[in-house]
């Protein structure tokens, strides 16, 4: 026993040593050796101990979905997919892991969040970080120059997530992208329209879509005196303006990123501005910005974009925001991000954003990175942040104490007397064959009260009750669970009656 206690203490001490070495950023070899020692100590503790100490949980940043949560998720997905299909998108799927090389150099500062897989004999693999880079790889690999597609799948990020705010290490993304050479800003405007349609349909509250352009950002940095090598890192600082004050952002740019204070001030004059098409017009007149070719192109495109957004009837939902600087390296043109707004405490206050629920932009160079000849396929797309939306919908339903059905069963086949299992089995089979969603209790002689109670709990609207008399008369008693009203229906009419009552089309098409 003393030996076991000593080993346990050694495991604890060795664990602390390993953590300490990692914090001190000790050499990889030393860490590797000390981890190997820790594993050898743990092995000496034997299997019993590890079973005892094993905590049953999902890995950090992941979660299970209960039937209730899945019901919410499927409703959200249904809204999104119907919208994507309404806009004529095809669907694709790609592997959950990619060659590490495919993902390298595409995400800038976020590359450190990519999950690498242990070597499985030759290929260095990483879990996908998003759906956009795999899409670009798919286009290049299949030599496609034209596609409108959606893709709904899980992605993986080695983040330190605040799961309470709907942030995870494994999460779904719902992406819609248009690839191809088209006239400026028409596909971009459609992407913004789709974003607004989905967020409106989901009824998760008021939202605002911030829009900017990478070319405007780059042009602005150039005229403010930021060196090319610092563009991306300064971008990531500016992008924090929705969360922290300008003072904090400026301190980061000057203190941590080595920007001259006067350069930071010049940037501040621009990035604190937001508005509509009038701000675009104003900046087109800006003596310095209008002299920059990149910025001028960006502003011209944004002006055109606002025209199309007005025609689509969504210009009131869009704000031109110079602080929007989406972190990903691959954006080349228009960028956008949708945020939910909290209702202001007092009228006249600025609406307050509570986090991004959708985002996207134009990435004209990404496919070219995979093409041996560097041939570009212009692309624009959007991604719906469904995990955050799931969280919001779940919270809203909890607040309303709304009961969510987790099954779609239309009818329970029940019996009022004993010894009718065979009849119940025959009837439920008939209903299944006719495309009716039906269930029965797995008991030979269930009590009628228990069967009715099951319907109440599961939200099943109808009960088809078989009795000896009904069998003789060739009818089935069809009972509405909520109103408790019962009618006798001829057996041959039962399918049609259930379909009529549950609003299901009369043929399975």
């Amino acid at each position: 026993m003393a030996e076991r206690a000593a080993l346990e203490e050694l495991v604890k001490l060795q664990g602390e040593r390993v953590r300490g070495l990692k914090q001190q950023k000790a050499s990889a070899e030393l860490i590797e050796e000390e981890v190997a020692k820790l594993l050898k100590l743990k092995a000496q503790l034997g299997p019993d101990e590890s079973k005892q100490k094993f905590v049953l949980k999902t890995p950090k940043g992941t979660r299970d979905y209960s039937p209730r949560q899945m019901a919410v998720r499927e409703k959200v997905f249904d809204v999104i997919i119907r919208c994507f299909k309404r806009h004529g998108a095809e669907v694709i799927d790609t592997p959950v892991f990619e060659l590490k090389e495919t993902l390298m150099g595409k995400y800038g500062e976020d590359s450190k969040l990519i999950y690498d897989l242990k070597d499985q004999g030759g290929e260095l693999l990483s879990l996908r970080y998003d759906l956009t880079v795999p899409f670009a790889r798919y286009l290049a690999m299949n030599k496609l120059t034209n596609i409108k597609r959606y893709h709904i799948a899980k992605v993986y990020r080695r983040d330190n997530p605040a799961m309470t705010r709907g942030r995870y290490r494994e999460f779904y993304q719902c992406d819609f992208d248009i690839a191809g050479n088209f006239d400026p800003m028409i596909p971009d405007a459609e992407c913004l329209k789709i974003m607004c349609e989905i967020l409106s349909s989901l009824q998760i509250g008021d939202f605002l879509v911030k829009v900017n352009d990478r070319r405007i950002l780059d042009g602005m940095f150039a005229i403010c005196g930021v060196s090319d090598s610092k563009f991306r890192t300064i971008c990531s600082s500016v992008d924090k303006l929705d969360k922290v004050s300008w003072e904090e952002v400026k301190n980061e740019m000057v203190g941590e990123k080595g920007l001259a204070p006067e350069v930071a001030d010049r940037i501040g004059d621009y990035v604190q501005q937001h508005g509509g098409v009038s701000l675009v017009e104003q900046l087109l007149q800006d003596p310095k910005l209008s002299q920059n070719k990149q910025a001028l192109e960006g502003l011209g495109d944004l002006k055109l974009l606002f025209e199309y957004l007005t025609l689509f009837g969504i210009d009131d939902k869009i704000s031109f925001d110079l602080s929007l600087a989406r972190g990903l390296d691959y954006y080349t043109g228009v960028i956008y991000e949708a945020v939910l707004l909290q209702t202001p405490a007092q009228a006249g206050e600025e609406p307050l954003g509570v986090g991004s629920v959708a985002a996207g932009g134009r990435y004209d160079g990404l496919v070219g990175m995979f093409d041996p000849k560097g041939r570009k396929v212009p692309c624009v797309g959007l991604s719906i942040g469904v995990e955050r939306i799931f969280s919001i919908v779940e919270q809203r339903l909890e607040a309303l104490e709304e009961k969510i059905r987790t099954t779609e069963t239309q009818v329970l086949v029940a019996s009022a007397q004993k010894k009718l299992l065979e009849e119940r089995l025959k009837l439920v089979s008939e209903l299944w064959d006719a495309g009716i969603k039906a269930e029965l209790l797995y008991k030979k002689n269930p009590k009628l009260l228990n069967q009715l109670q099951y319907c109440e709990e599961a939200g099943i609207p109808l009960v088809a009750i078989i009795g000896e008399q009904e069998l003789k008369d060739g009818v089935i008693k069809l009972r509405s669970v909520t109103s408790r009203e019962e009618v006798d229906v001829r057996r041959e009419d039962l399918v049609e009656e259930i379909k009529r009552r549950t609003g299901q089309p009369l043929c399975i098409c």
Epitope: A6, L13, Q44
Partner: antibody, heavy 120, light 107 residues
Framework: QVQLVESGGGLVKPGGSLRLSCAAS????????MSWIRQAPGKGLEWVSY????????KYTDKVRGRFTISRDNAKNSLYLQMNSLRAEDTAVYYC?????????????WGQGTLVTVSS | DIQMTQSPSSVSASVGDRVTITCRAS??????LAWFQQKPGKAPKLLIF???NLESGVPSRFSGSGSGTDFTLTISSLQPEDFATYYC?????????FGQGTKLEIK
């Protein structure tokens, strides 16, 4: 019972070489980190070198690095110390020692020691 | 390298006495400390590991305590066979270093 027996010590001239051996028995040798620890006459103890169970990791004190080489043969349950360019200050009793709980750098089993004398 | 300093260098005591030897590390070593006993012409023998764990077969009159930089070996009631030299050793980081030793003599 655990037994460690050193051999190979003796008198050698400065600049000369010696190879110490340690024969292990009574335990699963291939599971354990092993080390050489020395003690100059009338002085304290000094950890010289260690080698991991599968020979992946080895370390030496600054005083001997580049001159001494630790190695092991798990098939023969043997530990070795090849000593080159020997100096007068290397004169000591050399102990072969086993790590505690296979990997903890505390010697829980020692040999009887072998004396190395470096003198002209 | 981590320096280990033992005190006193030598101590005279009688059978039945309680004796305390201290060992100080030049920097924090958590509990990575061991105590050894060595008799003339013999190899050292492990008494205590990770500051306070008694090696099997070692009499319970020996005990160890401390963590960080300051450690103590206590012999609660000296027996004739306990007269020897005692060494502390840090196992925190290589090179693993020993104290200079404390010689326990009969008064």
């Amino acid at each position: 019972q655990v037994q460690l027996v050193e051999s190979g010590g003796g008198l050698v001239k400065p600049g000369g070489s010696l190879r110490l051996s340690c024969a292990a028995s009574g335990f699963t040798f291939s599971d354990y980190y092993m080390s050489w620890i020395r003690q100059a006459p009338g002085k304290g103890l000094e950890w010289v070198s260690y080698i991991s169970d599968k020979s992946r990791y080895t370390k030496y004190t600054d005083k001997v690095r580049g001159r001494f080489t630790i190695s092991r043969d798990n098939a023969k349950n043997s530990l070795y110390l090849q000593m080159n360019s020997l100096r007068a200050e290397d004169t000591a009793v050399y102990y072969c020692a086993r790590y505690l709980y296979q990997v903890i750098a505390i010697a829980d089993a020692w040999g009887q020691g072998t004396l190395v004398t470096v003198s002209s | 390298d981590i320096q280990m300093t033992q005190s006193p260098s030598s101590v005279s005591a009688s059978v039945g006495d309680r004796v305390t030897i201290t060992c100080r590390a030049s920097q924090g070593i958590s509990s990575w400390l061991a105590w050894f006993q060595q008799k003339p012409g013999k190899a050292p023998k492990l008494l205590i590991f990770v500051a306070s764990n008694l090696e099997s077969g070692v009499p319970s009159r020996f005990s160890g305590s401390g963590s960080g930089t300051d450690f103590t070996l206590t012999i609660s009631s000296l027996q004739p066979e306990d007269f020897a030299t005692y060494y502390c050793q840090q196992a925190e980081s290589f090179p693993y270093t020993f104290g200079q030793g404390t010689k326990l003599e009969i008064k």
